[in-house]
């Protein structure tokens, strides 16, 4: 059974990685970004369940094409860092799914801009934080 | 107004770890939008950048320090920390703390006033 | 990774107008934003010019920054010149993995 620090661990983990995937939407959205329109033809997969820890494993899976997107977007008025954030945001998910069980992902049929994507993950966490508090 | 104090002690000795702490007052680091930097200057010499973090905790530095730098944040003191550690002569320098913002790109301001650091025995 | 090159050295009269050049060794300059700041002795940095040209409120408008892409520099020019001007001045600027600062350059106001 889950003790109270390691229920504290993972939430402190999930408010972490909530946190840089709002970044990178805030990001996208508010500022004035020439390549908007480019990154939104770009597709990503969903999760066709996202309830569990578990399921993060299909977060991972897209990482590399979000940091290729990110890395594509780079302009004076968008500058991320995306290697290093992409690298944190990983490190945070390895922890968070644990390497115990391999899950294999299974995706949903109809893929999702940047923006949908990043949206998805982030009603993710919130929902998994607030089954923690 | 945003006003950043660095602390510390100013005398490491070589092969230890140096620790400096920022205090952020004036201004929440939770707010969101900036990272929270470490920038040093070596004695009449010009200024590097060491690294900076976001209140998430996620981590950036400069690639030549990467190995021996940790930055961590404490958002309910509203303060963020350096560890430089195997610290050698090459080490001593003003350490400045500062906040950066997080997408438009890597500027510093306002900068914290300085605390230097000297490595010897 | 990229440098940033400044002169040592400028000096020049109250009331005149100087330049102080900052060239970007590879890559664009006109690719990530400029910064400028003014390092008064025993002081820390202050921004006087961010995102290439853009002035923090309170710098005074006889400060002003540009680039040039045919030249790969940027440039701070400091119309006016004070003795309060007297200070090092940094370039700096970054890229998706650095962030660089200019050697700085000492302007003496004579």
């Known amino acids: 059974a889950p003790t109270s620090s390691s229920t504290k661990k993972t939430q402190l983990q999930l408010e972490h990685l909530l946190l840089d995937l709002q970044m990178i939407l805030n990001g996208i959205n508010n500022y004035k970004n020439p390549k908007l329109t480019r990154m939104l033809t770009f597709k990503f997969y969903m999760p066709k369940k996202a309830t569990e820890l578990k399921h993060l494993q299909c977060l991972e899976e897209e990482l590399k094409p979000l940091e290729e997107v990110l890395n594509l977007a780079q302009s004076k008025n968008f500058h991320l860092r995306p290697r290093d954030l992409i690298s944190n945001i990983n490190v945070i998910v390895l922890e968070l799914k644990g390497s115990e069980t391999t899950f294999m992902c299974e995706y949903a049929d109809e893929t999702a801009t940047i923006v949908e994507f990043l949206n998805r993950w982030i009603t993710f966490c919130q929902s998994i934080i607030s089954t923690l508090t | 107004q945003l006003q950043l104090q660095e602390s510390g002690p100013g005398l490491v000795k070589p092969s230890q770890t140096l620790s400096l702490t920022c205090t952020v007052s004036g201004g929440s680091i939770s707010s969101g939008g900036y990272y929270w930097s470490w920038i040093r200057q070596h004695p009449g010499k010009g200024l590097e950048w060491i690294g900076y973090?976001?209140?998430?905790?996620?981590?950036y530095w400069n690639p030549s320090l990467k190995s021996r730098v940790t930055i961590s944040v404490d958002t309910s003191k509203n303060q963020f920390s350096l560890k430089l550690s195997s610290v050698t002569a090459a080490d001593t320098a003003v350490y400045y703390c500062a906040r950066t913002p997080t997408v438009t790109g890597d500027w510093f301001d306002p900068w914290g006033r300085g605390t230097l650091v000297t490595v010897s025995s | 990774n990229f440098m940033l090159t400044q002169p040592h050295s400028v000096s020049e009269s109250p009331g005149k107008t100087v330049t102080i050049s900052c060239t970007r060794s590879?890559?664009?300059?006109?690719?990530?934003?400029v910064q400028w700041y003014q390092q008064r002795p025993g002081s820390s940095p202050t921004t006087v010019i961010y995102e290439d040209n853009q002035r923090p409120s309170g710098v005074p408008d006889r400060f002003s920054g540009s680039i040039d892409s045919s030249s790969n520099s940027a440039s701070l020019t400091i119309s006016g010149l004070k003795t309060e001007d007297e200070a090092d001045y940094y370039c700096q600027s970054y890229d998706t993995r650095d962030v660089v600062f200019g050697g700085g350059t000492k302007l003496t106001v004579l």
């Open positions: 973090i976001y209140y998430s905790g996620s981590n």
């Open positions: 590879s890559g664009s300059i006109a690719s990530n934003y």
